[in-house]
């Protein structure tokens, strides 16, 4: 069954945590659907963003942070492991120095920490996708 | 009650036709939700686009056409009559020489015909909005 989109869930992250998302683009890549995953510092959508991950399917991925309401330096990648019309599994792992983004089991993007992952309180998944799975796994202490 | 998004409906347009859309952005303008309305030449989403209207709420509007799979010259406007968090009513009227886009009863954008409006067979409304009304009115002969 489908999860609502935008999908918002409270989350606490630290080294070893992994966010797993399963979904499918809602349009063909020619029409440039988007997927966005945002790690927020508060439960409010206007809050700052520790890690912003946006896919323009078929074109590019941009990553960034939003600090005190201002977007910072954008990191862009043309790597496009997503397949037109196909379901994807995305996992974002919190490593000691960075986020590692896996797409369908393949390491595809990294983003160095700018803000401590412990500052994350909420994860939002949204834009032009249907969502079938969202999970945050916590490293056992 | 809400209409599904993406929302797709068969349509035949000519001078005097008006497409009316009521909806609401799914996120605050700080997060830059999008609204897109596409007038297609076929019932398929990969088909050419006679009139492409895309709002990045709070930032800008772009209009264009997609012909034989290729995007043409983009027309951009910074005019932003949409209100953060508020419902909008959008109407797109087919005039003899152009499309006229009204937002909440106010003439806000125009786009000169590049392709005959009679070539339109389908309208799609999508991206980051909830949709409560979609209507195509035809001029009585």
């Amino acid at each position: 069954s489908l999860l609502p989109v935008p999908y918002t869930e409270a989350a606490s992250l630290s080294t070893g945590s992994t966010v797993t998302i399963k979904g499918r683009p809602l349009a063909c890549f020619l029409n440039e659907p988007y997927l966005q995953v945002d790690f927020h510092t508060e439960m409010k959508e206007e809050s700052d963003i520790v890690f912003h991950f946006q896919v323009c399917f078929g074109r590019r991925v941009v990553m960034n942070s939003r600090e005190y309401g201002a977007w910072k330096q954008q990191v862009e990648s043309k790597n496009m492991p997503f397949q037109d019309g196909q379901e994807f599994e995305l996992s974002i792992s919190v490593l000691p120095d960075k986020y590692q983004v896996m797409v369908n089991g393949q390491s595809s993007y990294t983003f160095d920490h700018r803000i401590k992952p412990e500052a994350v309180k909420m994860v939002q998944v949204w834009r032009d996708i249907s969502l079938t799975k969202f999970n945050v796994s916590y490293l056992k202490r | 009650s809400l209409l599904p998004v993406p929302y797709t409906e068969a349509a035949s347009l000519s001078t005097g036709s008006t497409v009316t859309i009521k909806g609401r952005p799914l996120a605050c303008f700080l997060n830059e939700p999008y609204l897109q309305v596409d007038f297609h030449t076929e019932m398929k989403e990969e088909s050419d686009i006679v009139f492409h209207f895309q709002v990045c709420f709070g930032r800008r509007v772009v209009m264009n056409s997609r012909e034989y799979g290729a995007w043409k010259q983009q027309v951009e406007s910074k005019n932003m009559p949409f209100q953060d968090g508020q419902e909008f009513e959008l109407s797109i009227s087919v005039l003899p020489d152009k499309y006229q886009v009204m937002v909440n009863g106010q003439s806000s954008y125009t786009f000169d015909h590049r392709i005959k409006p009679e070539a339109v067979k389908m309208v799609q409304v999508w991206r980051d909005i909830s949709l409560t009304k979609f209507n195509v009115s035809y001029l009585k002969r």
């Epitope: - | 012909e67 290729a70 010259q73 003899p96 020489d97 000169d112 015909h113 590049r114 392709i115 005959k116």
Partner: antibody, heavy 122, light 107 residues
Framework: QVQRQESGPGLVKPSQTLSLTCTVS??????????WSWIRQPPGKGLEWIGY???????SYSPSLKSRTSISRDTSNNQFSLQLSSVTPEDTAVYYC??????????????WGKGTLVTVSS | SSALTQPSAVSVSLGQTARITCQGG??????VSWYTQKPGQAPVLVIY???ERPTGIPERFSGSSSGDTATLTISGAQAEDEADYYC??????????FGGGTHLTVL
């Protein structure tokens, strides 16, 4: 009343570059939604579109001439220019500049210059 | 050869109706324009958007299109209408094509 006037050398040697300028008076070449075209007409023959520059500065060229064509503009002097490289005698023609609202395929070209004859010969 | 095909010549008696055709365009999608040109002069736009007349063009000029054929009609042709006529359309909105031209003779 919008007027335009083509100017440039009337004689160009083969393999050289043909350069023409169109000076527009009575309206700005950056006025929204207007495009500015070059068209040519060989002696005794029909019209051939070469390309245009839009109000935004973007260009579009005829596929058959694209590899040799460049259209640019000088907004401070309200002029736009044509450069056609590697010319041959087949490029001998009257060259016209013209204006169109928005897409020329929709609205046609409503104002034309008088035309200037360019002969390609050694 | 032109992407749009016109008859090379059409004759009409003074006061009668002349029809000039233009074939081979995608007129279901793209509009057609028509120009008249007299010797030694620049072309003049007489019809745009299939059937619209610019200011100053006499009402006897009209246009239509259907499928792959567009037609320029001159109702009650005058001696001054003797000229070359060109159709113009597009293979896309940013690629302009002209017809080969038709010489109209008014008898």
């Amino acid at each position: 009343q919008v007027q335009r006037q083509e100017s440039g050398p009337g004689l160009v040697k083969p393999s050289q570059t043909l350069s023409l300028t169109c000076t527009v008076s009575g309206g700005s070449i950056t006025t929204n939604y207007y495009s500015w075209s070059w068209i040519r007409q060989p002696p005794g023959k029909g019209l051939e579109w070469i390309g245009y520059i839009a109000y935004s500065g973007s260009t579009s060229y005829s596929p058959s001439l694209k590899s040799r064509t460049s259209i640019s503009r000088d907004t401070s002097n309200n002029q736009f220019s044509l450069q056609l490289s590697s010319v041959t005698p087949e490029d001998t023609a009257v060259y016209y500049c013209a204006r169109s609202r928005s897409s020329p395929t929709t609205f046609g070209m409503d104002y034309w210059g008088k035309g200037t004859l360019v002969t390609v010969s050694s | 050869s032109s992407a749009l095909t016109q008859p090379s010549a059409v004759s009409v008696s003074l006061g009668q109706t002349a029809r000039i055709t233009c074939q081979g365009g995608n007129f279901g999608r793209y509009y057609v324009s028509w120009y008249t040109q007299k010797p030694g002069q620049a072309p003049v736009l007489v019809i745009y958007q299939d059937s619209e007349r610019p200011t100053g063009i006499p009402e006897r000029f009209s246009g239509s299109s259907s499928g792959d054929t567009a037609t320029l009609t001159i109702s009650g042709a005058q001696a001054e209408d003797e000229a070359d006529y060109y159709c113009q359309s597009g293979t896309s909105s940013d690629n302009i094509v002209f017809g080969g031209g038709t010489h109209l003779t008014v008898l």
